[in-house]
Interface confidence: low
């Protein structure tokens, strides 16, 4: 196979957040992030190769304690395909409850043209620290 | 490609811990752990092949309940490059808050000679159960 | 190498659960789940190729809040080899404490014929939402 398509993204939001959608970025200005195959469009990741992908994400809430997290509950993170509309689906969802970090991963088939969106519902802001909040994909097989 | 460099490590510290650095081990005496490419030096993992790696870690606190975890807060785990000093950086960081286990993963470029260190700050001890605490890397592409 | 053996499974239990063992399923009727190499036998995953595998799992408790989770503590998830009996071992274990989701992953050697079981101890039920509860494996190398 050619080198597998991969991406590791850092948060690139401007605050205060006007909508629940997290915007991602990559490149030297954003730590050790990169895109190698997939592309960023307005802060969302667009897939350029069909196949099975491993998605992973970690999001840490800024200025957060167990008390903050539970008081602002429910704070939920969801990763899904947001376009094309015909393929719209939630792929991964986690709530923070009394914690300030969620992290997970999964294998899922994605198609060329799928755009991935990550939504953080609730009033808390995500941390932009490069070791606390990140989102990545890795092509695994056709 | 040749077989990808991989490692899955188990905790190998002696306690009480004098410093926050966790020491890892591998081999038949430590469950199903191994190093295949990277090497252990004084309990830290040294990379022997440039490339993009998937890091993953799970750490469970010993003798821990939600109450213990919150009373000993902040207990934080950080994984980073600790040498060479010129490349020192935190790659992955999580706090326990009211939980007793953290688990995460990420993609990050590493270079031959990079040594990875894992620091657990706080007074709680990590569990050395082989199914509760482990740290691993997998080479993904150049 | 040929395409790596992979599987991504969804929960296929019928409730109320009579025993702590979670039963998994795959295929079009269960979201974006599939088996590609390994096979399902009575809801458990059977490995058909020796090698190093990456296991990952996320389990979310249904009708759960921090209060529920702590009141029903301990709720624990364990993933292990349950047959053949001679290779029986716990590979991955997490407790929920005051959270309602656990997620983790690890690298572990598996052999052809190993059957993986996932046990959820406690009285709470897992969510069957396809973006909240899933279990997968990916062959990494021989």
């Amino acid at each position: 196979h050619p080198e597998p398509h991969t991406a590791e993204l850092q948060l690139n939001l401007t605050v205060p957040r006007k909508d629940p959608t997290l915007r991602w970025g990559a490149g030297p200005a954003l730590g050790r992030s990169f895109t190698h195959g997939p592309e960023l469009e307005e802060g969302h990741l667009r897939i350029h190769q069909d196949g099975l992908y491993r998605l992973h994400i970690q999001v840490t809430l800024a200025i957060c304690s167990s008390t903050t997290a539970s008081r602002h509950h429910p704070t939920t993170l969801a990763v899904g395909i947001c376009s094309p509309a015909s393929r719209s689906i939630s792929l991964l969802r986690l709530s923070f409850h009394q914690g300030c970090t969620i992290a997970s991963q999964r294998l899922t088939p994605l198609a060329r043209g799928d755009t991935l969106c990550t939504n953080l519902t609730g009033t808390l802001l995500p941390s932009r620290n490069t070791d606390e909040t990140f989102f990545g994909v890795q092509w695994v097989r056709p | 490609h040749p077989e990808p460099h991989t490692a899955e490590l188990q905790l190998n510290l002696t306690v009480p811990r004098k410093d926050p650095t966790l020491r890892w081990g591998a081999g038949p005496a430590l469950g199903r752990s191994f190093t295949h490419g990277p090497e252990l030096e004084e309990g830290h993992l040294r990379i022997h092949q440039d490339g993009l790696y998937r890091l993953h870690i799970q750490v469970t606190l010993a003798i821990c309940s939600s109450t213990t975890a919150s009373r000993h807060h902040p207990t934080t785990l950080a994984v980073g490059i600790c040498s060479p000093a010129s490349r020192s950086i935190s790659l992955l960081r999580l706090s326990f808050h009211q939980g007793c286990t953290i688990a995460s993963q990420r993609l990050t470029p590493l270079a031959r000679g990079d040594t990875l260190c894992t620091n657990l700050t706080g007074t709680l001890l990590p569990s050395r159960n082989t199914d509760e605490t482990f740290f691993g890397v997998q080479w993904v592409r150049p | 190498h040929p395409e790596p053996h992979t599987a991504e499974l969804q929960l296929n239990l019928t409730v109320p659960r009579k025993d702590p063992t979670l039963r998994w399923g795959a295929g079009p009727a269960l979201g974006r789940s599939f088996t590609h190499g390994p096979e399902l036998e009575e809801g458990h995953l059977r490995i058909h190729q020796d090698g190093l595998y990456r296991l990952h799992i996320q389990v979310t408790l249904a009708i759960c809040s921090s209060t529920t989770a702590s009141r029903h503590h301990p709720t624990t998830l364990a993933v292990g080899i349950c047959s053949p009996a001679s290779r029986s071992i716990s590979l991955l274990r997490l407790s929920f404490h005051q959270g309602c989701t656990i997620a983790s992953q690890r690298l572990t050697p598996l052999a052809r014929g190993d059957t993986l079981c996932t046990n959820l101890t406690g009285t709470l039920l897992p969510s069957r939402n396809t973006d909240e509860t899933f279990f997968g494996v990916q062959w990494v190398r021989p």
Partner: antibody
């Protein structure tokens, strides 16, 4: 219900050997660290040895190091203690004890067998 | 010579309160020693009562409580009952991987 049943004790001469067994039931044996703890007649408790859940890591009290070997067979839900070069001071009731798994840096014994008596005497 | 020290014997009246202590021959006991308490009645195996200084094991009545008192770990029994008559052992975590047990305290419930 957790049950631990020891066997294999008895009278042995100094320098002799004995193998103790512990049959476990009522819990997932392969998840737990297991221990041997002994109690000399009319005395206190002494931790002897532990073995991790997979059987790959073992620790021993200094008093038995090099003479005793702990092992387990997860497929048989069994724990063993091979005792060689026995001395009079090894005379004790030997208990098989499960580590509570809270977790296992600090041995906390939440389930015990009834013990088996080992007498070392000429 | 025992590293972990306990009173050899104590007496309490039914319904009374008694505190057993567990010290180190040299140094203070702290929560980092993870004090653990076991109860043993004649001819029986020990039973776990308290771990991690003050956490009651499941099924242990709430008249048993653990704490650090000064430089020692303590087990307090309030409202003592006849079946609390037993030997009590404390265990301290001193160095990996072992625990050191105290010599035990024989508790007598008078009456």
């Amino acid at each position: 219900e957790v049950q631990l049943v020891e066997s294999g004790g008895g009278l042995v001469q100094p320098g002799g050997s004995l193998r103790l067994s512990c049959a476990a039931s009522g819990f997932t044996f392969s998840v737990y660290y297991m221990n041997w703890v002994r109690q000399a007649p009319g005395k206190g408790l002494e931790w002897v040895s532990d073995i991790n859940n997979e059987g790959g890591t073992t620790y021993y009290a200094d008093s038995v190091k090099g003479r005793f070997t702990i092992s387990r067979d997860n497929s048989k839900n069994s724990l063993y203690l091979q005792m060689n070069s026995l001395r009079a001071e090894d005379t004790a009731v030997y208990y098989c004890a499960r580590d509570a798994g809270y977790s296992n840096h600090v041995p906390i014994f939440d389930s015990w067998g009834q013990g088996t008596l080992v007498t070392v005497s000429s | 010579q025992a590293v972990v020290t306990q009173e050899p014997s104590l007496t309490v009246s039914p319904g009374g309160t008694v505190t057993l202590t567990c010290g180190l021959k040299s140094g203070s006991v702290t929560s980092d020693n993870f004090p653990t308490w076991y109860q043993q009645t004649p001819g029986q195996a020990p039973r776990l009562l308290i771990y991690n200084t003050n956490t009651r094991h499941s099924g242990v009545p709430d008249r048993f409580s653990g704490s650090i008192l000064g430089n020692k770990a303590a087990l307090t029994i309030t409202g003592a009952q006849a079946d609390d008559e037993a030997e009590y052992f404390c265990a301290l975590f001193i160095s990996n991987p072992s625990v050191e047990f105290g010599g035990g305290t024989q508790l007598t419930v008078l009456g």
